[in-house]
């Protein structure tokens, strides 16, 4: 049994980092496999992950860890029993993938204003809190090529748009994701879409 | 907004124990490493101990074997056991939570030691 | 034991002043684990800077660190009436543990 692709750890930076691998051959990940990994830090013990599978040769491990800080450094050992199949090391601050948005909401009653709202991902102590912005995605579900990004380059988790920049009468689908500059980190998962039915009331020509 | 508020100091005789509390809010304290510090009177900072997530734990070599460090974290609770407490013992003692560094204190509570 | 020594022991300015402060350590520490506070008569300390050079949350930028090795700075850009405190240098190391320095200081002049 030999690693065929090493993992690879992406952090919440929060209180979960996620890796990934891959053997050089079917495996039962849960019962074969033990990812062992601890904080390299006076005070912290070793913790053991239980992976599981992602595709026939592939394995995930859900790591749950203190808090995150910037100088954080984990050891990282992949048991097969009492076999070594790799020793590595995952700096959490340095593969950031932030969580998703959430409770993404579209306030339809503000005159002919979309305000679109969800909610920042992190408690107001976490770092992250006041470093993430946001890319808001809108499409619509009759017209595959109207479809749409707004960058949400400040800190407040809204998006307010006229109503009018969208075709009215038809229905519209939303949904959000997160990065934060300050890390580098990947874009977040998008949050789970809202729907809507636009309209609004045409102006009236001066003639 | 993180807090930690501090209780149990007061005045102990040479060789007494005495019980220091801290309790934590605005934060998961289940998830962080949290401290005693301490401050003798118009002295500098020093590190008393450490308690870990899990329990692991760390004392200065000036109060091993004396002091005991521990949590609740189902109360958010950090607690500092005392005994045979001596004169060099008396200063404010703060908790703290943190890791490498102290990011958020509490108010400090004083002991005095006394006869 | 880390030993940090901070100098000088006492700084006397005026506010609007530069004040830089020095940490020295009895041997090298990873600029990751150096910390600075400022400490107010009565008050507990508050983390200024972590990790030698970051500013911690709601720290004025006029507060910076700098550093590596075994000597660490900070420096306050231009001294405001409420910055005249004391200042301790914090090192951690994963045998040893905390130590601080003995404090600096600043004083108006």
């Known amino acids: 049994m030999k690693v065929l692709q090493e993992p690879t750890c992406v952090s919440d930076y929060m209180s979960i980092s996620t890796c990934e691998w891959k053997m050089n051959g079917p495996t039962n990940c849960s019962t074969e496999l033990r990812l062992l990994y601890q904080l390299v830090f006076l005070l912290s013990e070793a913790h053991t992950c239980i992976p599981e599978n992602n595709g026939g040769a592939g394995c995930v491990c859900h790591l749950l860890m203190d808090d995150v800080v910037s100088a954080d450094n984990y050891t990282l050992d992949l048991w097969a029993g009492q076999q070594l199949l790799w020793k590595g090391s995952f700096k959490p601050s340095e593969h950031v993938k932030p969580r998703a948005p959430g409770n993404l909401t579209v306030h339809t009653n503000v005159s002919d204003t979309l305000l679109l709202t969800w909610s920042n991902p992190y408690p107001p102590d976490n770092y992250l809190y006041n470093h993430l912005t946001y890319a808001v995605n809108i499409w619509s579900e009759n017209d595959p090529a109207d479809f749409r990004i707004y960058n949400v380059t400040y800190l407040e988790p809204s998006l307010r748009i006229a109503a009018s920049t969208l075709k009215s009468g038809i229905s519209y689908r939303a949904r959000v994701r997160a990065w934060a500059q300050c890390y580098n980190t990947t874009w977040s998962e998008w949050s789970p879409s809202t729907k809507w039915h636009n309209s609004y009331r045409e102006p009236f020509e001066q003639h | 907004e993180v807090q930690l508020v501090q209780s149990g100091g007061g005045l102990v005789h040479p060789g007494g124990s005495l019980r220091l509390s801290c309790a934590g809010s605005?934060?998961?304290?289940?998830?962080?490493?949290m401290f005693w510090v301490r401050q003798a009177p118009g002295k500098g900072l020093e590190w008393v101990s450490g308690?870990?997530?899990?329990?692991?734990?760390s004392y200065a070599d000036s109060v091993k074997g004396r002091f005991t460090i521990s949590r609740d974290n189902a109360k958010n609770s950090l607690y500092l056991q005392m005994n045979s407490l001596r004169a060099e013992d008396m200063a404010v003692y703060y908790c703290?939570?943190?890791?490498?560094?102290?990011?958020?204190w509490g108010q400090g509570t004083l002991v005095t030691v006394s006869s | 034991e880390i030993v940090l020594t901070q100098s000088p022991g006492t700084l006397s300015l005026s506010p609007g002043e530069r004040a830089t402060l020095s940490c020295r350590a009895s041997q090298s520490v990873s600029s990751s684990y150096l910390a600075w506070y400022q400490q107010k008569p009565g008050q507990a300390p508050r983390l200024l800077i972590f990790g030698a050079s970051s500013r911690a949350p709601g720290i004025p930028d006029r507060f910076s660190g700098s550093g590596s090795g075994t000597d660490f700075t900070l420096t306050i850009s231009r001294l405001e009436p409420e910055d005249f405190a004391v200042y301790y240098c914090?090192?951690?190391?994963?045998?040893?543990?905390?130590?601080f320095g003995q404090g600096t200081k600043v004083e108006i002049k």
């Open positions: 308690i870990g997530t899990g329990g692991a734990t």
């Open positions: 703290a939570r943190g890791r490498y560094y102290f990011d958020y």
């Open positions: 914090q090192q951690y190391d994963h045998s040893a543990g905390w130590t």
């Open positions: 605005g934060f998961t304290f289940s998830r962080n490493a």
